[in-house]
């Protein structure tokens, strides 16, 4: 089905539920820009490379971001 699109944001819905970090391939924080007027947090899952959109305002998502960044800082030399 061809489609018409207006703005180039990725997320159709956003979830307040954090994803399991073990299932995570990568986590992107995309700042607002001229293409998309809002911050988007996109979790790419290992299974099928599925992208999941997370609510930047959710407390649980903020905690997930902290946990992931803590994990990354442990790994970096």
């Amino acid at each position: 089905v061809p489609l018409s699109r207006t703005v180039r944001c990725t997320c159709i819905s956003i979830s307040n539920q954090p994803v399991n970090p073990r299932s995570l391939e990568k986590l992107e924080i995309i700042p607002a820009s001229q293409f998309c007027p809002r911050v988007e947090i996109i979790a790419t899952m290992k299974k099928k490379g599925e992208k999941r959109c997370l609510n930047p305002e959710s407390k649980a998502i903020k905690n997930l971001l902290k946990a992931v960044s803590k994990e990354r800082s442990k790994r970096s030399p």
Partner: antibody, heavy 119, light 111 residues
Framework: QVQLVESGGGVVQPGRSLRLSCAAS????????IHWVRQAPGKGLEWVAV????????YYADSVKGRFTISRDNSKNTLYLQMNSLRAEDTAVYYC????????????WGQGTLVTVSS | NFMLTQPHSVSESPGKTVTISCTGS????????VQWYQQRPGSSPTTVIY?????PSGVPDRFSGSIDSSSNSASLTISGLKTEDEADYYC??????????FGGGTKLTVL
Amino acid sequence: QVQLVESGGGVVQPGRSLRLSCAASGFTFSNSGIHWVRQAPGKGLEWVAVISYDGSNKYYADSVKGRFTISRDNSKNTLYLQMNSLRAEDTAVYYCARLRDNAEYTDYWGQGTLVTVSS
Amino acid sequence: NFMLTQPHSVSESPGKTVTISCTGSGGSIASNYVQWYQQRPGSSPTTVIYEDNQRPSGVPDRFSGSIDSSSNSASLTISGLKTEDEADYYCQSYDPLPVWVFGGGTKLTVL
């Protein structure tokens, strides 16, 4: 519990306009992309349009592009479908649906509202 | 464009097993999740399978879903058929997300 209730269907002449509404309750409407899906009498399901949770993204099937406009009012938990230049082939039951996507994993459907385009 | 093709109708006797196929064209069916909906006459669709092979709570384990990459198809299998399973069944995937694509639907008759 989750409810999606469509209204605004009816009989309309070809070339005229109609606006459908869908009142949502029982879930976080403002986090959810919502769709319109239609089903012509005796036919299968056809995806029509989707609007993102904040209204900034709208996607349409080619069959309705340029004629239909999807919109939402998050303060009223309501979704709309403005249908212009209606054709006989737009005759269908129109369902408002919260379908599985990249944030939500549960599907909810309204009961549908019938639009008949006939002279 | 990605399309999903289903048989128009299938029929089987109560207690037997039936499989409804959904064949993708114009893309790989395995690259996006497939959902299956059941629609009884006069009712809205309800999900019987999501994410290829997951069952929502309340759907009996007689319903199962699978993907076969080699034939680029998805299948819905219903075992121990009951008369209440008589309905239309639709597969659904993406072209890609956020464009939803439905198969044409299969009418299941339980003889």
